[in-house]
Amino acid sequence: VVDLNLLTEEVRLYSCTPRNFSVSIREELKRTDTIFWPGCLLVKRCGGNCACCLHNCNECQCVPSKVTKKYHEVLQLRPKTGVRGLHKSLTDVALEHHEECDCVCRGSTGG
Amino acid sequence: VVDLNLLTEEVRLYSCTPRNFSVSIREELKRTDTIFWPGCLLVKRCGGNCACCLHNCNECQCVPSKVTKKYHEVLQLRPKTGVRGLHKSLTDVALEHHEECDCVCRGSTGG
């Protein structure tokens, strides 16, 4: 027999959690005239949903409650003066990782 | 030294994958006259993103490539016909689970 209370607890614990998302480094760093290799990296970002939120609010959202910066070594390619050749350099880029997530009320509709 | 090709492969493999999502059973089954306990269940659905899609298209989306139906035992509460009170019964509900996911082109803009 299934423990229905356990199912409810499972939903609460695992529906809104840090997950793998690929982010475009160029977009993340707003560095439009630089190409990075790889162009995307895996980061942990809050994901999933709060479909059955325990808060008393109209709309619940899954947000980070603990954020850290992590450094990733990537190859950076930038145009030189002219039409041929690129500056190539290894560089460390800092990207936000979400370590913990929470279901919270969107806006100020009580909680 | 970081293997940059390995990072690219990691992004490809893990950015668009089956993840835990909580779904409202009533909404999923379109059964507005019935209350289920628990109201939500965890299912595997394709999530993440395709930020650095390998396809030649303007917009790439993360979609299921293998879908299965799984049965979940829940408590179902329905109004009795013509009298006060609720029918209580344990029932199996079938929910879609995504087992494999793929990044594909949205619309028909090449591949």
């Epitope: 560095r31 005239d33 050749g85 | -």
Partner: antibody, heavy 119, light 112 residues
């Protein structure tokens, strides 16, 4: 399939202005540098301008600096060439060309659009 | 500016025979990154130019292996081992190592 389609050419009087467009499809436009190259009966092929992936890097030959401006709209997958103070010697077929990923060569060219500067 | 001089300007060739086009630069065309950015483009009648060879000797994808590039310093050559009817057009060399980048004046290949 990579496609580059130029438009906006036509007849302009000396001293006039014109904007050429190049619509790109079949590739991730924002990940490529782009260039304009023109072809005149007298001078043959001549490089006109180059722009980086995001638009903040631009480069021109001295002879066209100040008169010509290259720009791009990555949301619209379109490259532009704004030409001011046009002269008879600017009469040419204007091609847009894609820079290879590592800026090693022009790997794809459009079909060209003809600009005629004449009174 | 670096001047690129091609010869001959006109090249009549018999089908199936080899052809050779020379391109000389007014100064050495080695980029600051050590690469020689010398390219060859073919413009067929009524079409836009298309890439044949890049960085002196690298064939672009889809280009038949009868086309080959060679050279260094200031002297470069494009060779066609056996000319076919579809090879007709104007061949241009191009240097991108120095600014501004410049094209040769073109060599018109025609069938005898």
């Amino acid at each position: 399939e990579v496609q580059l389609l130029e438009s906006g050419g036509g007849l302009v009087q000396p001293g006039g202005s014109l904007r050429l467009s190049c619509a790109a499809s079949g590739f991730t436009f924002s990940s490529y540098g782009m260039s304009w190259v023109r072809q005149t009966p007298g001078k043959g092929l001549e490089w006109v301008a180059t722009i980086g992936y995001g638009g903040s890097f631009t480069y021109y030959p001295d002879s066209m600096k100040g008169r010509f401006t290259i720009s791009r709209d990555n949301a619209k997958n379109t490259l532009y060439l704004q030409m001011n103070s046009l002269r008879a010697e600017d009469t040419a077929v204007y091609y847009c060309a894609r820079q290879a990923p590592l800026w090693d060569y022009f790997d794809y060219w459009g079909q060209g659009t003809l600009l005629t500067v004449s009174s | 500016d670096v001047v690129m001089t091609q010869s001959p300007l006109s090249l009549p060739v018999t089908l199936g025979q080899p052809a050779s086009i020379s391109c000389r630069s007014s100064q050495t065309i080695v980029h600051s990154d050590g690469t020689t950015y010398l390219e060859w483009y073919l413009q067929k009648p009524g079409q836009s130019p298309r890439l044949l060879i890049y960085k002196v000797s690298n064939r672009f994808s889809g280009v038949p292996d009868r086309f080959s590039g060679s050279g260094s310093g200031t002297d470069f050559t494009l060779k066609i081992s056996r000319v076919e009817a579809e090879d007709v057009g104007v061949y241009y060399c191009f240097q991108g190592s120095h600014v501004p980048p410049t094209f040769g004046q073109g060599t018109k290949l025609e069938i005898k």
